[in-house]
């Protein structure tokens, strides 16, 4: 059977440019190694935002220079994207891959529309 991935339809980033959402997958197999990727879809272009591989029961580790952080609990991943600006508003897709043991499984969510509003600059005080 194919793997199903669920994620929220819409998330509003905080005034500090931080957006968090949960990505949940229904695992058809007993995976010990899982890869989670956040993709951004703009028009028909899909680009990778960040990716992390983790062993089941261990923490999710993104690269040091990644704009993403995350935690995992069972078949659920809590993802946080930082440093977002208004121009980053768009559809963010959660992709889950069961890497080991074989067989490999792919699961792709429908995407979370993240809205980012740049904060108004503070007015100069007299």
């Amino acid at each position: 059977k194919a793997m199903h991935v669920a994620q929220p339809a819409v998330v509003l980033a905080s005034s500090r440019g931080i957006a968090s959402f949960v990505c949940e997958y229904a695992s058809p197999g007993k995976a010990t190694e899982v890869r989670v990727t956040v993709l951004r879809q703009a028009d028909s272009q899909v680009t990778e935002v960040c990716a992390a591989t983790y062993m089941m029961g261990n923490e999710l580790t993104f690269l040091d220079d990644s704009i993403c952080t995350g935690t995992s609990s069972g078949n659920q991943v809590n993802l946080t994207i930082q440093g977002l600006r208004a121009m980053d508003t768009g559809l963010y897709i959660c992709k889950v891959e069961l890497m080991y043991p074989p067989p490999y499984y792919l699961g792709i969510g429908n995407g979370t529309q993240i809205y980012v509003i740049d904060p108004e600059p503070c007015p100069d005080s007299d």
Epitope: K1, A2, M3, H4, P28, E33, R35, T37, L39, V46, T47, E48, A51, T53, I93, K95, E97, M99, Y100, P102, P103, Y104, Y105, L106, G107, I108
Partner: antibody, heavy 105, light 102 residues
Framework: PGRSLRLSCAAS????????IHWVRQAPGKGLEWVAV????????DYADSVKGRFTISRDNSKNTLYLQMNSLRAEDTAVYYC???????????WGQGTLVTVSS | QSPGTLSLSPGERATLSCRAS??????LAWYQQKPGQAPRLLIY???SRATGIPDRFSGSGSGTDFTLTISRLEPEDFAVYYC?????????FGPGTKVDIK
């Protein structure tokens, strides 16, 4: 038959280590047959039953190169072998031009 | 995949079918291959057109039954078409449908 051969596939124009890469083959006048895949850092691999134990897929991310080591070759391994990149959403979006491998007695 | 061969004239509509033995959700792609060339991605996710693919090509279906439709055949569309599931390994291809000129 019984001989060995190593195929290589050099990639450019994209971040090689961010993509899985497949080998797909096509026997003369026949359809496409999936052979093997290798993922990202090269630790995770998968093979078709028809080549398991005889073929080994590997990659060198520092050289942006994919390999297929083919041992104990049989006449039925005669085919054009294609390397193909996995797109972010899963399908095979870019294919090599193919290499013809002929196994004859 | 069915039919094995489809004989049609330019301007006609082509309907190609692909059936999976078990559900592959929407993890299905269609490829076009011309003689002496590598396959080219047409459709992914069952219904999304790949970059640069004309809108006369469309895909539909989910689960086990999928369709590739070419609304009006152009001379360059006469080729072999393959479906492939990519939701799990092994990544199987269909046997192909040849669209040739009647």
């Amino acid at each position: 038959p019984g001989r060995s051969l190593r195929l290589s596939c050099a990639a450019s124009g994209f971040t090689f280590s961010s993509h899985g890469i497949h080998w797909v083959r096509q026997a003369p006048g026949k359809g496409l047959e999936w052979v093997a895949v290798i993922w990202y850092d090269g630790r995770n691999k998968d093979y078709a039953d028809s080549v398991k134990g005889r073929f080994t897929i590997s990659r060198d991310n520092s050289k942006n190169t994919l390999y297929l080591q083919m041992n104990s070759l049989r006449a039925e391994d005669t085919a054009v072998y294609y390397c193909a990149r996995v797109a972010p959403l899963g399908p095979l979006d870019y294919w090599g031009q193919g290499t013809l491998v002929t196994v004859s007695s | 995949q069915s039919p094995g061969t489809l004989s049609l004239s330019p301007g006609e509509r082509a309907t190609l079918s692909c059936r999976a033995s078990q559900s592959v959700s929407s993890y299905l792609a269609w490829y076009q291959q011309k003689p002496g060339q590598a396959p080219r991605l047409l459709i992914y996710g069952a219904s999304s057109r790949a970059t640069g693919i004309p809108d006369r090509f469309s895909g539909s279906g989910s689960g086990t039954d999928f369709t590739l439709t070419i609304s009006r055949l152009e001379p360059e569309d006469f080729a072999v078409y393959y479906c492939q599931q990519y939701g799990r390994s092994p990544f199987t291809f269909g046997p192909g449908t040849k669209v040739d000129i009647k």
